[in-house]
Amino acid sequence: QDCSAQCQCAAEAAPHCPAGVSLVLDGCGCCRVCAKQLGELCTERDPCDPHKGLFCDFGSPANRKIGVCTAKDGAPCVFGGSVYRSGESFQSSCKYQCTCLDGAVGCVPLCSMDVRLPSPDCPFPRRVKLPGKCCEEWVCDEPKDRTAVGPALAAYRLEDTFGPDPTMMRANCLVQTTEWSACSKTCGMGISTRVTNDNTFCRLEKQSRLCMVRPCEADLEENIKKGKKCIRTPKIAKPVKFELSGCTSVKTYRAKFCGVCTDGRCCTPHRTTTLPVEFKCPDGEIMKKNMMFIKTCACHYNCPGDNDIFESLYYRKMYGDMAHHHHHH
């Protein structure tokens, strides 16, 4: 970095840094910048956070332009508003035991992450937070006609199905299912969720599905016809295979995606359906995931703000998929 030139800062005022990020002078001593954090790329202009014992590791001398923020041996850690010495162990909450090591915090769970499979003694296991207990514990939702000690009671064994009749369970259940949330990514593979109690025990559960509003690599603006400002549902030239964490969909899909606008409007899915997609991984493992498929898109000015976690209701909702109840227990 040549610091001989006159100082030129991007903005008059000092930038506003996120909580826990230091405001420091750049490598030339010119401008105040937000310090880069552990593992982030750094340059002499964009220095690492010195208050956390970080330095810009440029690697071999040949590559002196871009480095990675690395902790000095024995660097402290900042975690949850507290500073911990390297080697110091602490409980971040009753659920996790953490250790600071050279600027990095590693935590291990103190609560059992055990899974409970259904059995006659516990047909509907679920984890709940019990008063006065830190860790969630397993409880068994049970029919009212169960014995105090376990399944063995011949008089109640006449029915073919164990436990209450599901139709009876549903009789006094007001079934409610929210709309699917907007896709977590504006391009590429994301997640969409909803909450429903449309199950045997009328219990609220969160369902999720994969979603892709549009591929990230597509340059959709090129396809907008002259005089038009939007392309709502661009034609996909060829069938595509979806990718998820290195796994590829077994089948190819001629999927619809949403387009883009040049007038500030957003195009988002309007009517969708949910279908299972099988992904094959490099190790041969096959996993089945529910995925959103777009039927129609809508272009509108009701766009989410960059940092708005409470995105507008219109944007959040997708319609036409209420009939597809894919349960994820």
Epitope: S112, D114, V115, R116, S119, C122, W138, P151, A154
Partner: antibody, heavy 114, light 110 residues
Framework: EVQLQESGPGLVKPSQTLSLTCTVS????????VHWIRQHPGKGLEWIGV???????DYNAAFMSRVTISKDTSKNQVSLKLSSVTAADTAVYYC????????WGQGTTVTVSS | ETVVTQEPSLTVSPGGTVTLTCRSS?????????ANWVQQKPGQAFRGLIG???NRAPWTPARFSGSLLGGKAALTLSGVQPEDEAEYYC?????????FGGGTKLTVLG
């Protein structure tokens, strides 16, 4: 970490009572039931019985008259008692956790011989 | 006496698909039989793969799936791996007791 460990004498005399203990760690026997299963040499698995999380028991009818499964919640231990044993009771005995028989002990070999 | 029957042995090629079944002598297997599938690899302890017909244990790969097929409990392995070679037992619940099947020896060729 969930673990089950069977223990008890490896040799029992005919007509005597076979007594085995399953010591559990990583979960509570007041939350999960524990099953006893055995396997004769070169053969399949035979379910003996279970003590459910709240203390109730169910047994294989073939053992009903001579089997007792009990537990000591304070020690997180489950015990199996099989009376009037014969050479036909020579087998590897396993305890396993209820809920998909997900976790098993390594098994303990019991030989019935005079 | 209730008898639970499994295929004594099955052979499959790596990458192939195979279905192990578990038949009840007293009628169709239903969800109230809480079908369980247990695996034993040579020299290793038993471990449960599937419980309650179709619920996978945390360590069970997604290529293993439990279901009911034609009145029988079924364990389907898709994209079989060499390490899937093992003995597989099913266990069915009959209101007062469990009954284990005789086991299926799965051989993976190659």
């Amino acid at each position: 970490e969930v673990q089950l460990q069977e223990s008890g004498p490896g040799l029992v005399k005919p007509s005597q009572t076979l007594s085995l203990t399953c010591t559990v760690s990583g979960f509570s026997i007041s939350t999960f039931g524990v099953h006893w299963i055995r396997q004769h040499p070169g053969k399949g698995l035979e379910w003996i019985g279970v003590i459910w999380r709240r203390g109730g028991t169910d047994y294989n009818a073939a053992f009903m008259s001579r089997v007792t499964i009990s537990k000591d919640t304070s020690k997180n231990q489950v015990s199996l008692k099989l009376s009037s044993v014969t050479a036909a009771d020579t087998a590897v005995y396993y305890c396993a956790r209820d809920g998909g028989f997900d976790y098993w002990g390594q098994g303990t070999t019991v030989t019935v011989s005079s | 006496e209730t008898v639970v029957t499994q295929e004594p042995s099955l052979t499959v090629s790596p990458g192939g698909t195979v279905t192990l079944t578990c038949r009840s002598s007293i009628g169709a297997v239903t969800t109230s039989n809480y079908a369980n599938w247990v695996q034993q690899k040579p020299g290793q302890a038993f471990r449960g793969l599937i419980g309650g017909t179709s619920n996978r244990a945390p360590w069970t790969p997604a290529r293993f799936s439990g279901s009911l097929l034609g009145g029988k409990a079924a364990l389907t392995l898709s994209g079989v791996q060499p390490e899937d070679e093992a003995e597989y037992y099913c266990a069915l619940w009959y209101s007062t007791h469990y009954v284990f099947g005789g086991g299926t020896k799965l051989t993976v060729l190659g």
